[in-house]
C-alpha cells in the first residue's frame, strides 16, 4: 500500500495544469453497487499560501490539477495535500493519504550584486592575482543553472588585463589579473561587471551591474639602462 504520493509542477503554470494522480483500491463490487466506487477529495493543503485552494482533485480519477495562479517556488517550494478517498461514491468509509507537490524552478529571478560597488588594491606586475570576490544573491533553486552566475566584464578593461570566473560553490565572481598592471602607465582601473545565469531568464529581467575600482600599487622596480 502507498499512503504518500509525490508529484511536481513548474512554478507559474496556468490553472488547469495536471500535476499527478493518486489511486486508492477497493475490493468491493463497483459494477452492480456503489460499495467499491471511490470518490476523491482534498481535505487540507499546507501551507495555505498564497491561499488554501491552489489545487483540485478529480472526484473519480484522482487526478490533481492546479486550480489557481500564483505557484511561486521562491515562496513555497513544496505543498502537502491531505487526500481523502471515500467508497460508496463518497458516502461510505474514508481513508486518507498525503500528496507532496514539488514546485519546480523556473529562472524567474535575476542574480543581484550585493554590494554593487567594490574597491581593490593590486600590486603592479602581478599575474593571476586575485583582485576581488564579487557576491551575488539569487532566489532561484541553489546550485541549479537558474542560480549559477555567469560574469562578464562589460567595460573598463581596455587592455584586457582582467578575467572573471565563477566559484563553483559560493557562486562568487573571482576577479583576477590576466596580465600584469603597470602603475606608471595607469594607476587606477574602473571595471563594470554584469551578471546573468547559466540558464536563460524565462521573462524579461533587469541585469545587475557592479563597479570595481582597482587601485594599482607601485612596486619598486630596478633601473633599466
Amino acid at each position: 500500500t502507498q499512503d504518500t504520493f509525490r508529484g511536481s509542477v513548474l512554478e507559474g503554470v496556468l490553472p488547469g495544469t495536471s500535476v499527478m494522480q493518486v489511486t486508492a483500491t477497493d475490493e468491493d463490487d463497483a459494477i452492480y453497487t456503489y460499495n467499491g466506487v471511490v470518490a476523491y477529495s482534498i481535505h487540507s493543503q499546507e501551507p495555505k499560501d498564497p491561499h488554501d485552494l491552489m489545487f483540485t482533485i478529480h472526484r473519480s480519477t484522482g487526478t490533481i490539477s492546479v486550480i489557481s495562479s500564483g505557484l511561486d517556488r521562491e515562496k513555497v517550494p513544496e505543498y502537502t495535500l491531505t487526500i481523502q478517498a471515500t467508497d460508496m461514491d463518497g458516502d461510505g468509509s474514508t481513508t486518507t493519504a498525503v500528496a507532496v507537490v514539488e514546485i519546480l524552478d523556473a529562472n524567474d529571478n535575476a542574480p543581484m550584486f550585493d554590494p554593487q560597488k567594490y574597491e581593490a588594491h593590486v600590486p603592479e606586475n602581478a599575474v593571476g592575482h586575485e583582485v576581488q570576490r564579487l557576491t551575488v544573491t539569487d532566489l532561484d533553486a541553489p546550485n541549479s543553472p537558474a542560480w549559477r552566475a555567469t560574469y562578464l566584464i562589460m567595460g573598463g578593461d581596455d587592455g584586457d588585463h582582467f578575467t572573471i570566473t565563477t566559484h563553483p560553490e559560493s557562486n562568487q565572481g573571482i576577479l583576477t589579473t590576466r596580465k600584469g598592471l603597470d602603475f606608471e602607465a595607469k594607476n587606477q582601473h574602473t571595471l563594470y561587471v554584469e551578471v546573468t545565469n547559466e540558464a536563460p531568464f524565462v521573462l524579461k529581467l533587469p541585469t545587475s551591474t557592479a563597479t570595481i575600482v582597482v587601485h594599482v600599487e607601485d612596486v619598486n622596480e630596478a633601473p633599466v639602462f
Epitope: T1, Q2, D3, T4, R6, G7, S8, E46, P47, D49, E74, K75, V76, P77, E78, T80, V98, V100, E102, T137, D138, L139, D140, A141, P142, N143, S144, W147
Partner: antibody, heavy 120, light 113 residues
Framework: QVQLQESGPGLVKPSETLSLTCTVS????????WTWIRQPAGKGLEWIGR???????NYTPSLKSRVTMSVDTSKNQFSLKLSSVTAADTAVYFC??????????????WGQGTLVTVSS | DIVMTQSPDSLAVSLGERATINCKSS????????????LAWYQQKPGQPPKLLIY???TRESGVPDRFSGSGSGTDFTLTISSLQAEDVAVYYC?????????FGQGTKVEIK
C-alpha cells in the same frame, strides 16, 4: 562554510513554552528549508518541522498543535517555540539545513545541539 | 508517516572488514518521474550531531571517504562500509524525504569486534 548554532534556555518548567533560536553564519538563510530535529537521551532522531526562508512551514502531525516556527532573514536566524511542554519533551534539540540538489530533504549542515530539560 | 526500519540494531565488525546496514521503508521512496530514491544516510558519534554521508540513496556527500557506499531502490536500502576503520564506530541512521514529514530509522550501532 555554513555553520549553525542553537541558543536558548536549557531548563524549562512543565506547561511552559520552550523557545530556541538557530543562528546561521557563513552563508545566507535564503533559498533553503531550515529544520528542527530532537533526540531524547539514548534514543533516535525525531523530525519536528521546517521553515522555508519565505516563512512557509511544515510541522510533524503529532506536534503540530504545539509548534510554531519563524524566520528572520535580516538576522540570518530561525526559531522554534514548543508550548505546553512536559518531561517527554526533554531532549537534545538540533537545528539543521535541508540541502538542495534537484530537490530538498536531506540534512547537510547541523548545529551542535542544545540540551533542553523540562523540569520544575 | 513512512516508517523506516533498520537492521540489525547493532553489529560488531573486525577492523578492515565489511559492515552492512539495512534499511527498509514502509512504502516506496522512489519517485519515478525523477528516477530518484528519496533516502539519506547519517553517521552520529557520541556528543556530536549526525553527519550526512549519502543522499539520493547512493550519492556520497563531499568529503565522505569512498569506503562508504549506499545502494538499493524502492523500499530496501543498504549502507556498506567496505573496510571498517576505528573512526567509523558510531550510530548510523537512514532517513526518508519522500514525504514532507521526514522520518528516521531507529539507528544501527557499529562497534569493533
Amino acid at each position: 562554510q555554513v555553520q549553525l548554532q542553537e541558543s536558548g534556555p536549557g531548563l524549562v518548567k512543565p506547561s511552559e513554552t520552550l523557545s530556541l533560536t538557530c543562528t546561521v553564519s557563513g552563508g545566507s538563510i535564503n533559498n533553503y528549508y531550515w529544520t528542527w530535529i530532537r533526540q531524547p537521551a539514548g534514543k533516535g532522531l525525531e523530525w519536528i518541522g521546517r521553515i522555508y526562508s519565505s516563512g512557509s512551514t511544515n510541522y510533524t502531525p503529532s506536534l503540530k498543535s504545539r509548534v510554531t516556527m519563524s524566520v528572520d532573514t535580516s538576522k540570518n536566524q530561525f526559531s522554534l517555540k514548543l508550548s505546553s511542554v512536559t518531561a517527554a519533551d526533554t531532549a537534545v534539540y538540533f537545528c539543521a539545513r535541508e540541502g538542495y540538489n534537484d530537490g530538498y530533504g536531506y540534512f547537510d549542515h547541523w548545529g551542535q545541539g542544545t540540551l533542553v530539560t523540562v523540569s520544575s | 508517516d513512512i516508517v523506516m526500519t533498520q537492521s540489525p540494531d547493532s553489529l560488531a565488525v573486525s577492523l578492515g572488514e565489511r559492515a552492512t546496514i539495512n534499511c527498509k521503508s514502509s512504502q516506496s521512496v522512489l519517485y519515478s518521474s525523477k528516477n530518484k530514491n528519496y533516502l539519506a544516510w547519517y553517521q552520529q558519534k557520541p556528543g556530536q550531531p549526525p553527519k550526512l554521508l549519502i543522499y539520493w540513496a547512493s550519492t556520497r556527500e563531499s568529503g565522505v571517504p569512498d569506503r562508504f557506499s549506499g545502494s538499493g531502490s524502492g523500499t530496501d536500502f543498504t549502507l556498506t562500509i567496505s573496510s571498517l576503520q576505528a573512526e567509523d564506530v558510531a550510530v548510523y541512521y537512514c532517513q526518508q524525504y519522500y514525504s514532507t514529514f521526514r522520518t528516521f530509522g531507529q539507528g544501527t550501532k557499529v562497534e569493533i569486534k
